[in-house]
């Protein structure tokens, strides 16, 4: 994922409790990962800026049959104001860059932790 340090708002900001739950879920995924996450599936990288939650969901929704990220997909759908279906793409995807789901989750986690801190202290 690119633009990790972007100052733009991440779109509709979830309440801190919901954001905290999403982060906890991503932490669980990264800590419990033994075999390659989602069999090493690749997803489109996204810009972590406005509309990030929808973009993340649009990327991850194209991964099927991976129970490890199903809860994350459900949580992200709660943060995205519009319905997202497989094959849908927004301008936030870095369409020339695909990364493994595991890396996508790690990058998203780092950024969400940062957003959580910003929300706590500002």
């Amino acid at each position: 994922l690119t633009c990790l340090g972007g100052f733009a708002s991440p779109g509709p900001v979830p309440p801190s409790t919901a954001l905290r739950e999403l982060i906890e879920e991503l932490v669980n995924i990264t800590q419990n990962q033994k075999a390659p996450l989602c069999n090493g599936s690749m997803v489109w990288s996204i810009n972590l800026t406005a509309g990030m939650y929808c973009a993340a969901l649009e990327s991850l929704i194209n991964v099927s049959g991976c129970s490890a990220i199903e809860k994350t997909q459900r949580m992200l759908s709660g943060f995205c104001p519009h319905k997202v279906s497989a094959g849908q793409f927004s301008s936030l995807h870095v369409r020339d860059t695909k990364i493994e789901v595991a890396q996508f989750v790690k990058d998203l986690l780092l950024h969400l932790k940062k957003l959580f801190r910003e929300g706590q202290f500002n």
């Epitope: 409790t17 905290r20 932790k113 940062k114 959580f116 801190r117 910003e118 706590q120 202290f121 500002n122």
Partner: antibody, heavy 120, light 107 residues
């Protein structure tokens, strides 16, 4: 190895201001929040406030009624706690503490403490 | 502010004893609770976070449990180096608040 190294003991007069530093090593300074905790002699622990070193955003305990100023210098990986209008009840050991909120908790790492004595 | 009520304030125990310390929050803290050990003249040391997760390097005789408002720190078999003061901390919301402490002394 994570280390938080605090500045040395201070003796101050009532009404004065003290500024304590906390130099971080062993992790990326902006990755974890930094908090400050007061411990008066023979007493328990009290949270004073915290700062996000990345943005400089702060939160503090109303008990200190705006007397606490928290800052962070990203260029030197150092956090600072300034306590003004000192009174005798502020005589205490002050600790800086940090950590990953989601992986160890926000108070996973501690400085060695700085004793501040307020006396006329 | 969330109040953290820790009990007992002190206890006497022998090496090998099972020791239990409790912390009660004035409202649900979503298991955002840590436990610390402090020895005289030293900084606190983190033992448990998120109510039941053991900090790396902490002996397995320490364990945390509980949810909602009621939490427990258990030392399954007290060792000589465990005589110290223990504190709980809620970090669910600001202002973060500590329990009053429990001093574990030698019987």
């Amino acid at each position: 190895e994570v280390q938080l190294v605090q500045s040395g003991a201070e003796v101050k007069k009532p009404g004065a201001t003290v500024k304590i530093s906390c130099k971080v090593s062993g992790y990326t300074f902006t990755d974890y929040e930094m908090h400050w905790v007061q411990q008066a002699p023979g007493k328990g622990l009290e949270w004073m406030g915290g700062i996000d070193p990345e943005t400089g955003g702060t939160a503090s305990n109303q008990k200190f009624k705006g007397r606490v100023t928290l800052t962070a210098d990203k260029s030197t990986d150092t956090a600072y706690m300034e306590l003004s209008s000192l009174r005798s009840e502020d005589t205490a050991v002050y600790y800086c503490t940090s950590g990953d909120y989601f992986g160890g908790g926000p108070f996973a790492y501690w400085g060695q403490g700085t004793l501040v004595t307020v006396s006329s | 502010d969330i109040q953290m009520t820790q009990s007992p304030s002190s206890l006497s125990a022998s090496v090998g004893d099972r020791v239990t310390i409790t912390c009660k929050a004035s409202q649900d803290i979503n298991s955002y609770l840590s436990w610390f050990q402090q020895k005289p003249g030293k900084a606190p040391k983190s033992l448990i976070y998120r109510a039941n997760r053991l900090v790396d390097g902490v002996p397995s005789r320490f364990s945390g449990s509980g949810s909602g408002t009621d939490f427990t720190l258990t030392i399954s078999s007290l060792q000589p180096e465990d005589f110290a003061t223990y504190y709980c901390l809620q970090y669910d919301e600001f202002p973060y608040t500590f329990g009053g402490g429990t001093k574990v002394e030698i019987k």
